[in-house]
């Protein structure tokens, strides 16, 4: 008789999830000498231990603490780039500007990027059929709790000037309900961070509006200022040109507004 299985609203665990996590860990530790000491089998065991045999709507940050400990990593605190709804450009930027780091440039972020996972209460099985959706099912699911945990720690570590890339094509350029808006903004440490600088990325070719005046950006400025952190904002009108100028800043075309 087939066992009854909970059906969730979200996609199931990414296929070959254990193999993917392990392979990513090995690759990352080979490329980053400062993480060569990491035992990837132990990392996978800690990752698995955070959600296997647990109800996928009842995951806590505490469940991920063994993984957090194994994945402890020091990134330069003044070289942090946060992002919201514009991950690809943020990653393209840090691939060129190698001294800047997004969360996905750290071991733990790299392991989990674009993956989904969940288990089932009281069985050691991984659920490849469905996993809880944050809105439709529950917020304390394995994926959401993981990203909340690592995002909080990443923001807490930041210092000096912190940059955030925001998507100027969205109706809410700054969204209070995004990971940036709900977690990272509130975990920047005012005693360490002097300024948050938003880079608002324009989508349209002929869009010359000052999106730094957008009401949601003003809302972000208000939240940040109340936390005793300075706020600055920069329009990036041509993201393609911006990336070219990061790659080749001496190019004559880079003297005009990006």
């Amino acid at each position: 008789v087939p066992r009854w299985r909970q059906q969730w609203s979200g996609p199931g665990t990414t296929k070959r999830f254990p193999e993917t996590v392990l392979a990513r860990c090995v690759k990352y530790t080979e490329i980053h000498p400062e993480m060569r000491h990491v035992d990837c089998q132990s990392v996978w065991d800690a990752f698995k231990g955070a959600f296997i045999s647990k109800h996928p709507c009842n995951i806590t940050e505490e469940d991920y603490q063994p993984l957090m400990k194994l994945g402890t990593q020091t990134v330069p605190c003044n070289k942090i780039l946060l992002w919201s709804r514009i991950k690809d450009l943020a990653h393209q930027f840090t691939q060129v500007q190698r001294d800047m780091f997004t969360l996905e440039d750290t071991l733990l972020g790299y392991l989990a990027d674009d993956l989904t996972w969940c288990g089932e209460f009281n069985t050691s099985k991984i659920n490849y059929q469905s996993c809880p959706d944050w809105r439709k099912d529950c917020s304390n699911n394995p994926v959401s709790v993981f990203w909340k945990t690592v995002s909080r720690r990443f923001a807490e570590a930041a210092c000096d000037v912190v940059h955030v890339m925001l998507n100027g094509s969205r109706s809410k350029i700054f969204d209070k309900n995004s990971t940036f808006g709900s977690v990272e903004v509130h975990n920047l440490q005012p005693e360490k961070v002097q300024t948050l600088e938003a880079w608002v990325i324009h989508g349209g070719r002929e869009d010359s509006r000052d999106l730094c005046q957008d009401p949601t950006i003003k809302e972000l400025e208000s939240i940040i200022s109340k936390r005793n952190i300075q706020f600055s904002c920069k329009n990036i009108y041509r993201p393609d040109k911006f990336l070219q100028c990061v790659k080749n800043p001496e190019d004559s075309s880079c003297t005009s507004e990006i």
Epitope: N78, K79, Q97, D99, M100, D160, V161, H163, Q194, T195, L196, E197, A198, W199, Q230, S232, C233, K234, C245, V246, P249, E250, C254, T255, E257, I258
Partner: nanobody, 122 residues
Framework: EVQLVESGGGLVQAGGSLRLSCAVS????????MGWFRQAPGKEREFVAA???????LYADSVKGRFTLSRDNPKNTAYLQMDSLKPEDTAVYFC????????????????WGQGTQVTVSS
């Protein structure tokens, strides 16, 4: 070729003010983060303040609340307004440029000016 030229230094009494300027030519100033450093005789070059290409600011604890950074992109110039000056602010002040983001370490800056002397008498 990128050139940085500081001006505005001089002799001032303790409690007084000076405004330093750093004019940039030959480069994409609007993409520069500008840093200010100082060096007193026999001492290491010390970070003072920096401003990003988006005008975000960063100050050393020793000058916070007394010094103010700004930039004028059309004029290709960065400014360091120094108020409530103290004798320990006496040094040669250098401006430096790097692309996009700030840093505290002198080694991260690609372009440097020749420096301008600031002397604060008691």
């Amino acid at each position: 070729e990128v050139q940085l030229v500081e001006s505005g230094g001089g002799l001032v009494q303790a409690g007084g003010s000076l405004r330093l300027s750093c004019a940039v030519s030959g480069g994409a100033f609007n993409n520069f983060a500008m840093g200010w450093f100082r060096q007193a005789p026999g001492k290491e070059r010390e970070f003072v303040a920096a401003i990003t290409w988006g005008s975000g600011t960063l100050y050393a604890d020793s000058v916070k609340g007394r010094f103010t950074l700004s930039r004028d992109n059309p004029k290709n110039t960065a400014y360091l307004q120094m108020d409530s000056l103290k004798p320990e602010d006496t040094a040669v002040y250098f401006c430096a440029g790097k692309y996009f983001t700030t840093a505290r370490l002198p080694a991260e800056y690609k372009y440097w000016g020749q420096g301008t002397q600031v002397t604060v008498s008691s």
